[in-house]
C-alpha cells in the first residue's frame, strides 16, 4: 500500500477519504484506526454503523466522525477541531468477521495554523501540497508516498 | 536506531554564509516534520526553524527570517539549514531535531548538534 | 510569542528527594506542554509531552501536571543521574523554551 499524506491545519476540520471497490467490499462494514509508531498495531478509533445499510450514518467518537458512501466506494473521515496530537499513521479498513484489509494507508500530518503563529514565516493556507519524487497528488490536501520510496539503511 | 548527524559547523566570519546538514537513518525520513534548535554556549535552548514531512511548508523564528532557510531532500534523508548574513548573535550549537509523524510541533529525537561560531 | 519562566533556575536536593519544578507562560499553553532534560555536553532529552504523556522509555518517577498557564515537572525521588538542566517547551503558539533549571546536587 501506498501512504497518503492529508495535510490539515491545527483548529480546522480535516477530511480524510478513502476509495474503494463497492462490489469487491459490499455488505462491509469499514473502520478508521490509528496506527502506533511506524510498525506498530493499527488502534480501532471508530467504525460505521453496525447495520450495513446504515453505513451512510456518520458516527462519531470524540472528535472524529466516519461515513461511508457504499454505492459509490468512497468512506469519508472527518477529523474536527485537528489538534498536534492527532498527527500520525492511520489506516481506513474493510471488515469481514474478525478480520479487516486496508483500504488505505493515511498519514495526517498537522500544520501550525499561520493565524495562531505570528513567529511563522512562509505564512501559506491549505492548498495543494507539494508531492513527493514518483508520487502523485491524490487531490488537493494529500500526496501519496510509494512505501520504500524513500530507502533506508537500518539504523529522524 | 534512530540517527541524526549535525555537520558544515565551523569557524564563519559575520555576513557570511554557512549550510549545515543532518542526514537520518533509523526511521522513515518522510513521515516527519523536522525542526533545528541552537544553543548559544552556556546559554539556554532556542526554535530556530521548522519543516513539514514535504518541505512544503516552513516557519522561522522571527531573528533569522529572511537570512534563514530550511529544507530537506527526503530522497536523501536529509535535512538542511542555509544560513546566511550571519551574526555573532548566531553562534550557537545547531541541533537537527525530529518532531513525531506528521507534526514538528513536539522533537523526539535529537543529533549531538554542530557548532557554528561566527566571529571576525 | 509566549514567554515561559521557569523557576527556581538552580535548584539543590539531595538523591531520594522529592523535586518540583515550575514553568509559567505568559498565556494559556493549553496544555501544550513538554519537558526536556539536558545532561552536560549532550543533546537534549525528551521526557514528556502533553503536559503529562511520558514518553516511552522514561522512569516512572519522572510525571508531569498543570493546566492553563501553570506547569509542574516532578520528580518523585531524585536519582543521581536526574542531575541536569530541565527545559519547559511550548507548542501551543509558536515554539518556546523555558530559560531552564538546573538540578544539582546538595
Known amino acids: 500500500h501506498n501512504t497518503t499524506v492529508f495535510q490539515g491545519v491545527a483548529g480546522q476540520s480535516l477530511q480524510v477519504s478513502c476509495p474503494y471497490d463497492s462490489m469487491k467490499h459490499w455488505g462491509r462494514r469499514k473502520a478508521w484506526c490509528r496506527q502506533l509508531g511506524e510498525k506498530g498495531p493499527c488502534q480501532r478509533v471508530v467504525s460505521t454503523h453496525n447495520l450495513w445499510l446504515l453505513s451512510f450514518l456518520r458516527r462519531w467518537n470524540g472528535s472524529t466522525a466516519i461515513t461511508d458512501d457504499t454505492l459509490g466506494g468512497t468512506l469519508t473521515i472527518t477529523l474536527r477541531n485537528l489538534q498536534p496530537h492527532d498527527a500520525g499513521l492511520y489506516q481506513c479498513q474493510s471488515l469481514h468477521g474478525s478480520e479487516a484489509d486496508t483500504l488505505r494507508k493515511v498519514l495526517v500530518e498537522v500544520l501550525a495554523d499561520p493565524l495562531d503563529h505570528r513567529d511563522a514565516g512562509d505564512l501559506w493556507f491549505p492548498g495543494e501540497s507539494e508531492s513527493f519524487e514518483d508520487a502523485h497528488v491524490e487531490h488537493s490536501i494529500s500526496r501519496s508516498l510509494l512505501e520504500g520510496e524513500i530507502p533506508f539503511p537500518p539504523t529522524s | 536506531e534512530v540517527q541524526l548527524v549535525e555537520s558544515g559547523g565551523g569557524l564563519v566570519q559575520p555576513g557570511r554564509s554557512l549550510k549545515l546538514s543532518c542526514p537520518a537513518s533509523?526511521?522513515?525520513?518522510?513521515?516527519?516534520?523536522m525542526a533545528w534548535v541552537r544553543q548559544a554556549p552556556t546559554k539556554g535552548l532556542e526554535w530556530v526553524a521548522s519543516?513539514?514531512?514535504?518541505?512544503?511548508?516552513?516557519y522561522y523564528r522571527d531573528s533569522v527570517k529572511g537570512r534563514f532557510t530550511i529544507s530537506r531532500d527526503n530522497a536523501k534523508n536529509t535535512l538542511y539549514l542555509q544560513m546566511d548574513s550571519l551574526r555573532s548573535e548566531d553562534t550557537a550549537t545547531y541541533y537537527c531535531?525530529?518532531?513525531?509523524?506528521?507534526?514538528?510541533?513536539?522533537?523526539?529525537?535529537w543529533g549531538q548538534g554542530t557548532l557554528v561560531t561566527v566571529s571576525s | 510569542n509566549i514567554q515561559l519562566t521557569q523557576s527556581p533556575s538552580l535548584l539543590s536536593a539531595s538523591v531520594g528527594d522529592r523535586v518540583t519544578l515550575s514553568c509559567k507562560g505568559s498565556q494559556n499553553i493549553n496544555n501544550y506542554l513538554a519537558w526536556y532534560q539536558q545532561k552536560l555536553g549532550e543533546a537534549p532529552k525528551l521526557l514528556i509531552y502533553?503536559?503529562?504523556s511520558l514518553l516511552t522509555g522514561i522512569p516512572s518517577r519522572f510525571s508531569g501536571s498543570g493546566s492553563g498557564t501553570d506547569y509542574t515537572l516532578t520528580i518523585s525521588s531524585l536519582h543521581s543521574e536526574d542531575l541536569a538542566t530541565y527545559y519547559c517547551y511550548q507548542y501551543n503558539n509558536g515554539w518556546t523554551f523555558g530559560g531552564g533549571t538546573k538540578l544539582e546536587l546538595k
Open positions: 531535531a525530529r518532531g513525531d509523524i506528521g507534526t514538528a510541533y513536539w522533537f523526539t529525537y
Open positions: 502533553k503536559t503529562n
Open positions: 533509523g526511521f522513515t525520513f518522510s513521515y516527519y516534520g
Open positions: 519543516i513539514s514531512t514535504g518541505g512544503g511548508n516552513t
